[in-house]
């Protein structure tokens, strides 16, 4: 009679992770008497699959029944797999023996490859703002799929960028792999609305790519420019200031007026209106009392943004264009947009 | 050279449930089976529960088949014994081992290494 072959049919088998993998294995003989055994990988250091003698095998299932006296069919069902589970899957016929029993035959082995999906993107930006004309870098990361081919782009609002770093980890084999991305990116004063999109390709995701955004609203800050304009006389000892701070992103404002050097006022944005763009405006009014001054007033608005230096703009109010000097003590009373004032 | 360390034991009554934890070190922990064994006075050393590398297969002692669960987390370098419905006769030590080769219950024989081993007393 011929001696006894381990047949597995199958060199290869791929497996989408979650899903149940069947490895094939076939005896072409019920001698010599003895269990059979699954083991991935091979030699000294391979792992103990499934032992048709003894264990707990939560995730392996036998196609056929094993404790049939005339069955050679070996084959297992592996459930719920894993990137970690993939390898060669040999199929070996042991004869038994005493003490122990004696590996007699393997099969020549079948690969198993697990396609997994790669998880969504996840894309940051820079810990601190940064303003227009200045370069940030974003980082894309993806892990967890397998195989190890996969695409990565960039976009911003639709246009794919083209000045990006990507790596793929680890080098070598492995069961699974992860992406990581790093895009620069050019600030403009229009960015406010912007998006940056991280786009990951895989086999598993059916051309369906997954994708990874950050909003440049989180990423940007457009400082203000600053306008102090003298209004028409409102009275005849009364002269109207305003300055209009314009363009500026985030919300977050501190405006402090000075008169001559001397604080008069502060107040923090609150009715501000929105830009197109993304971007506020606001306006601050100051109501001075020229005839408490003798001399020209230097009038500055002075702006902190974001927790930025501030910025200010002056001007400077020419007393003598005003000849009559009455009425009360008080220099200046400083409104905000509501106009509230005491006269 | 694989360092193990077990930790978990203790008192308790009959019944009650306890879990053991080993932490390994010194090795990549994904190429190693892990087994549990225990060592009553006066007795033997004997085998627990067993491991494959990757933990898809288990293998358990009679005596603490249905009771014990052994498991394994190889990103946290640790295995695990849950025991439950403790009797007095599980009192005794518990050894975490590792094995560079595993063929089920011969695991014993196959163990290259040992933890020093916690106390587990299980009191009527």
């Known amino acids: 009679e011929e001696e006894l072959q381990v047949i597995q049919p199958d060199k290869s088998v791929l497996v989408a992770a979650g899903e149940t993998a069947t490895l094939r294995c076939t005896a072409t003989s019920l001698i010599p008497v003895g269990p059979i055994q699954w083991f991935r990988g091979a030699g000294p250091g391979r792992e103990l699959i499934y032992n048709q003698k003894e264990g707990h095998f939560p995730r392996v299932t036998t196609v056929s029944d094993l404790t049939k006296r005339n069955n050679m069919d070996f084959s297992i069902r592996i459930g719920n797999i894993t990137p970690a589970d993939a390898g060669t899957y040999y199929c070996v016929k042991f004869r038994k023996g005493s003490p122990d029993d004696v590996e007699f035959k393997s099969g020549a082995g079948t690969e198993l490859s697990v396609r997994a999906k790669p998880s969504a993107p996840v894309v940051s930006g820079p810990a601190a703002r940064a303003t227009p004309q200045h370069t940030v870098s974003f980082t894309c990361e993806s892990h967890g799929f397998s195989p190890r081919d996969i695409t990565l782009k960039w976009f911003k609002n639709g246009n794919e960028l083209s000045d990006f770093q990507t790596n793929v980890d680890p080098v070598g084999e492995s069961v699974s792999y992860s992406i990581h991305s790093t895009a620069k990116v050019v600030l403009t004063r229009e960015d406010v609305h912007s998006q940056v999109i991280c786009e990951v390709a895989h086999v598993t995701l059916q051309g369906d790519p997954l994708r990874g955004t950050a909003n440049l609203s989180e990423t940007i800050r457009v400082p203000p420019t600053l306008e102090v304009t003298q209004q028409p006389v409102r009275a005849e000892n009364q002269v109207n200031v305003t300055c209009q701070v314009r363009k500026f992103y985030p919300q977050r404002l501190q405006l402090t007026w000075l008169e001559n050097g001397n604080v008069s006022r502060t107040e923090t944005a609150s009715t501000v209106t929105e830009n197109k763009d993304g971007t506020y405006n606001w306006m601050s009014w100051l109501l001075v009392n020229v005839s408490a001054h003798r001399d020209d007033v230097k009038l500055t608005c002075q702006v902190e943004h974001d927790g930025q230096p501030a910025v200010s703009k002056s001007h400077d109010l020419k007393v003598s264009a005003h000849p009559k000097e009455q009425g009360s003590n008080t220099a200046a009373e400083n409104t905000g947009s509501n106009e509230r004032n005491i006269y | 050279q694989v360092q193990l360390q077990e930790s978990g034991g203790g008192v308790v009554q009959a019944g009650d449930s306890l879990g053991l934890s080993c932490v390994a070190s010194?090795?990549?922990?994904?190429?190693?089976?892990m087994g549990w064994f225990r060592q009553a006075p006066g007795k033997e050393r004997e085998f627990v529960a067993g491991?494959?590398?990757?933990?898809?297969?288990?293998y358990y002692a009679d005596s603490m088949k249905g009771r014990f669960t052994i498991s394994r987390d190889n990103a946290k370098n640790l295995v695990y014994l849950q025991m439950n419905s403790l009797k007095p006769e599980d009192t005794a030590v518990y050894y975490c081992?590792?094995?560079?080769?595993?063929?089920?219950?011969?695991?014993?024989?196959?163990?290259?290494?040992w933890g020093q081993g916690t106390q587990v007393t299980v009191s009527s």
């Open positions: 491991i494959s590398r990757s933990g898809i297969s288990q």
């Open positions: 010194g090795r990549t922990f994904s190429s190693l089976d």
């Open positions: 081992a590792a094995a560079l080769t595993f063929r089920g219950s011969d695991l014993p024989r196959d163990s290259n290494y």
